[in-house]
Interface confidence: low
Amino acid sequence: FKNDATEILYSHVVKPVPAHPSSNSTLNQARNGGRHFSSTGLDRNSRVQVGCRELRSTKYISDGQCTSISPLKELVCAGECLPLPVLPNWIGGGYGTKYWSRRSSQEWRCVNDKTRTQRIQLQCQDGSTRTYKITVVTACKCKRYTRQHNESSHNFESVSPAKPAQHHRERKRASKSSKHSLS
């Protein structure tokens, strides 16, 4: 039988589970999708990023004892950025200097822009499958933040008796993930 209860999980609260040794997929594989400018005259400790830095994340989702059948691919929006409209001024050196001098009170952060809800199947130890709804980030945007901003864009909302997924120790899986899991 299948347990078709649908629960809502958000991908930021779950931790990747290692793939079976024979699998060649790398978890938490990320590649840098943004272009960078050197910011030496403005902030010698960091590099200013033009547009958003979009990391591509590949991970398995687990609720602790059930694990996704296939890895989930999504974007992770990370770091500081410059909104694209100001780039010409930045390159010209005018607006940019002014902008960076005001960093103490406000900054531009790369945040989630577009998301979609997708169903994923988790396979469980006893052979049953459990269906979850996951919000997956599909695009990032550059957003201005003041110090008062609190970045809590996700709320956990469960529609079943399951507790929210939590971080947990990685653990070995005894068999390759596939359509059924094994008892």
Partner: antibody
């Protein structure tokens, strides 16, 4: 050493409720799901379902939906099986069991000693 | 549900004999990942079942090498090369390829 220790035998009347406990030791309780298996006198084994000890979500086999409830007391590393509105056919030994590995494709390696529930008027 | 059929239901043996138990499933137990999740258990009177063989032919830790398992698809066999007194009891086959997990009715190995 891994141990699953179950509560003692129960004698109940039809219509009553019984709650069996299974205390786990020797491993991290929330890492492995706990299944329950029924064995009626002189009969074979029947898998009843399991509970995810990490999330608390139970899954029941078709024949055990309704009157049967799996629950946990995680702080005490204990799983429970409750049977409501007992019937004569619930007379059986009930085992709590755990797999050898996280996904237990390697069979059920660890069994409690069993709890005999007798239902009789 | 997958039905597991064991034969014989009773197997009288003499100590030192070879014993063979057959288990047939109502559908193939080969999983899409290539593994076959067929297991054997021994239950002695008044005790819990104990895992003997997992995934057709793998002996669980501490199980003597006189026990061996074989088979594929829907037909499986457990062999005891030389039966000892401690081997007497009821043997169950079980599958965990399909949900729900199911068991055979058992084969009672007893002295002639």
């Amino acid at each position: 050493q891994i141990h699953l220790v179950q509560s003692g035998p129960e004698l109940k009347k039809p219509g009553e409720t019984v709650k069996i406990s299974c205390k786990a030791s020797g491993f991290s309780f929330t890492t492995y799901g706990m299944s329950w298996v029924k064995q009626a006198p002189g009969k074979g084994l029947k898998w009843m379902g399991w509970i995810n000890t990490y999330s608390g979500v139970p899954t029941y086999a078709d024949d055990f939906k309704g009157r049967f409830a799996f629950s946990l007391e995680t702080s005490a590393s204990t799983a429970y099986l409750q049977i409501n509105n007992l019937k004569n056919e619930d007379t059986a030994t009930y085992f709590c069991v755990r797999g050898r590995e996280y996904y237990y494709g390697s069979g059920i390696a660890f069994w409690g000693q069993g709890t005999l529930v007798t239902v009789s008027a | 549900d997958v039905v597991m059929t064991q034969t014989p239901l009773s197997l009288p043996v003499s100590l030192g004999d070879q014993a063979s138990i057959s288990c047939r499933s109502s559908q193939s137990l080969e999983h899409s990942n290539g593994n076959t999740y067929l297991h054997w258990y021994l239950q002695k009177p008044g005790q819990s079942p104990k895992l003997l063989i997992y995934k057709v032919s793998n002996r669980f830790s501490g199980v003597p090498d006189r026990f061996s398992g074989s088979g594929s698809g829907t037909d499986f066999t457990l062999k005891i090369s030389r039966v000892e007194a401690e081997d007497l009891g009821v043997y169950f086959c079980s599958q965990s390829t399909h949900v729900p997990l199911t068991f055979g009715a058992g084969t009672k190995v007893e002295l002639k």
